[in-house]
């Protein structure tokens, strides 16, 4: 059974999101220390953006936006040439669409306007200088801060960020980067005391952790790959979970195995945990599916819905496991560990 994540996570989501957002954008700024005036402009935008994000509800929708912003951040950090800003604009286009679906549109509009101005500011920055070490460190920290369950810990992180932000704003010269390293050291120490409901590279959604593979395996080997990391080829339990996973798969333009097949009895679809496919879930099959053409006995995410395909074919896969509870008694305040890599191809 899925273990519940403490309610403090949802209660403090706004604060987490502000922190997470601040880190993400700050990371992009750190890579560009040579123009103080531009950085100051970015910090002003961040302040407004942080305030807007902090007030917003709709955790699940906002998480989509934060994931997009993370990708935007990566694009900015890795692509200094202006000609390559097209990727950033594509991210913003998707973000704008996501914003359009959310309640409190006035607030969302505010976020979008801030992002537009931020994008413009970033687009004018010179090529990134040699801040690679800082950049990589912040990448790790950003991932860690994504799921902060305790208010006191959040406050500590927030204070560290404030000091770090101030330090960066005052440091147009490379010679003064020692101060940034000191701030990072403190920030890292604070992060390492936090609980992490999901391993690195996994995505948290409604009390569970999901791993989207970057390699391909057949259906049976995908089951094995998930077991090897203490998880299960994904079993879908709710409409919300289905929508989340379908979006992940379709937006990555991938065909992705799920833990559903009719291998045991033709025409009787069953999840890998032994539970039957409920009638209410049959709506997710694509038109004309499942058709069992050529012994198609395993289910995949395909486009806007599900398809049955041959189990021997290599596709991407999604693993699922319960998020860690954040009790100190359970000794789960562990130092961050590297992401579990994809198992080698079969």
């Amino acid at each position: 059974q899925v273990s519940k994540v403490p309610s403090s996570i949802s209660q403090e989501q706004s604060r987490q999101d502000a922190i997470y957002q601040n880190l993400t954008q700050l990371k992009a700024a750190v890579g560009e220390l040579s123009e103080k005036s531009k950085l100051q402009e970015i910090y002003q935008e961040l302040t407004q953006l942080k305030a807007a994000v902090g007030e917003l509800p709709e955790k699940s929708k906002l998480q989509e936006i934060y994931q997009e912003l993370t990708r935007l951040k990566a694009a900015v950090g890795e692509l200094p040439e202006k000609s390559k800003l097209q990727e950033i604009y594509q991210e913003l286009t998707w973000l704008k669409a996501a914003v359009g679906e959310l309640p409190e549109k006035s607030k969302m509009q505010e976020i979008y306007q801030e992002l537009t101005r931020l994008k413009a500011a970033v687009g004018e920055l010179p090529e990134k200088s040699k801040q690679q070490e800082i950049y990589q460190e912040l990448t790790r920290l950003k991932a860690a801060v994504g799921e902060l369950p305790e208010k006191s810990k959040q406050q500590e992180i927030y204070q560290e960020l404030t000091r770090l932000k101030a330090a960066v704003g005052e440091l147009p010269e490379k010679s003064k980067q020692q101060e940034i390293y000191q701030e990072l050291t403190q920030l890292k120490a604070a992060v390492e005391r936090l609980c992490h409901p999901c391993p690195w590279e996994w995505t948290f959604f409604q009390g569970n952790c999901y791993f989207m593979s970057n390699s391909q395996r057949n259906w049976h080997d995908s089951i094995t790959a998930c077991k090897e990391v203490g998880a299960q080829l994904v079993v879908i339990k709710s409409a919300e979970e289905q929508n989340f996973l379908q979006l992940q798969s379709s937006r990555s333009n991938r065909f992705t195995w799920m833990g559903l097949s009719d291998l045991n009895q033709e025409g009787t679809w069953q999840w890998v945990d032994g539970s039957p496919l409920l009638p209410s879930f049959k709506q997710y099959w694509n038109r004309g599916e499942p058709n069992n053409v050529g012994e198609e006995d395993c289910a995949e995410f395909s486009g806007n819905g599900w398809n049955d395909d041959k189990c021997n074919l290599a596709k991407f896969w999604i693993c699922k496991k319960s998020a860690a509870s954040c009790s100190r008694d359970e000794e789960q305040f562990l130092s961050p560990a590297p992401a579990t890599p994809n198992p080698p191809p079969a």
């Epitope: 391909q216 012994e295 395909s302 819905g305 041959k310 021997n312 074919l313």
Partner: antibody
Framework: QVQLQQSGPQSVRPGASVKISCKAS????????MGWVKQRPGQGLEWIGM????????RLNQEFKDKATLTVDKSSSTVYMQLSSPTSEDSAIYYC????????????WGQGTTLTVSS | DVLMTQSPLSLPVSLGDKASISCRSS???????????LEWYLQRPGQSPKLLIF???NRFSGVPDRFSGSGSGTDFILKISRVEAEDLGVYYC?????????FGGGTKLEIK
């Protein structure tokens, strides 16, 4: 890395059956459909069909159902295409291709086998 | 069968120029799963074709960002923002939504 190595150029008389091969390496052979594409001199590309090396299921373009037979030898990770009763219309370069089921694309192509049919 | 028609047949360009190739299908090529399996392949002189774009607008791994695809339904376009020498060759559109899968007749990108 994925490699598809095709057999060398062949010349055959009209009516004499011909078989060309494609040896795959660098990946799990039975986990991807293998297909064939025809390119006549100075012309475009035509999809002939594909075969699943796992169970030898083949799906053919109806235009080639009486022309092409696809087979597989799992032990050598090789797929074959036999062309029956070839005519000058069958003179072409034939490519074997891998259909990637994770993206639904032809992500790897062999170097091509040139078939010349003449008397 | 779905007929894929490309234009122009030949496209003379100077290096550094923009280039645009059109592909029109004889019927809508949206798959039953809601996606559109429209791909673009480049065949350089003396070589095998190579995948550039899949699902209308997604660059395949390793493809430079000067290549972009767009379109929907029956009309699709491949654009090259600034042509480089390695881009010369024949471009083919391909639909994998309806069996039999079909290629366009090709567009030859060549130097003026």
């Amino acid at each position: 890395q994925v490699q598809l190595q095709q057999s060398g150029p062949q010349s055959v008389r009209p009516g004499a059956s011909v078989k060309i091969s494609c040896k795959a390496s660098g990946y799990s052979f039975t986990s991807y459909w293998m297909g064939w594409v025809k390119q006549r001199p100075g012309q475009g590309l035509e999809w002939i069909g594909m075969i699943d090396p796992f169970d030898s299921e083949s799906r053919l373009n109806q235009e080639f159902k009486d022309k092409a037979t696809l087979t597989v030898d799992k032990s050598s990770s090789t797929v074959y295409m036999q062309l029956s009763s070839p005519t000058s219309e069958d003179s072409a370069i034939y490519y074997c291709v891998r259909r990637n089921g994770g993206y639904y694309v032809f992500d790897s192509w062999g170097q091509g086998t040139t078939l010349t049919v003449s008397s | 069968d779905v007929l894929m028609t490309q234009s122009p047949l030949s496209l003379p360009v100077s290096l550094g120029d923009k280039a645009s190739i059109s592909c029109r299908s004889s019927q809508n090529i949206v798959h039953s799963n809601g996606d559109t399996y429209l791909e673009w392949y480049l065949q350089r002189p003396g070589q095998s074709p190579k995948l550039l774009i899949f699902k209308v607008s997604n660059r395949f791994s390793g493809v430079p960002d000067r290549f972009s695809g767009s379109g929907s339904g029956t009309d699709f376009i491949l654009k090259i923002s600034r042509v480089e020498a390695e881009d010369l060759g024949v471009y083919y559109c391909f639909q994998g939504s309806h069996v039999p899968w079909t290629f366009g007749g090709g567009t030859k990108l060549e130097i003026k």
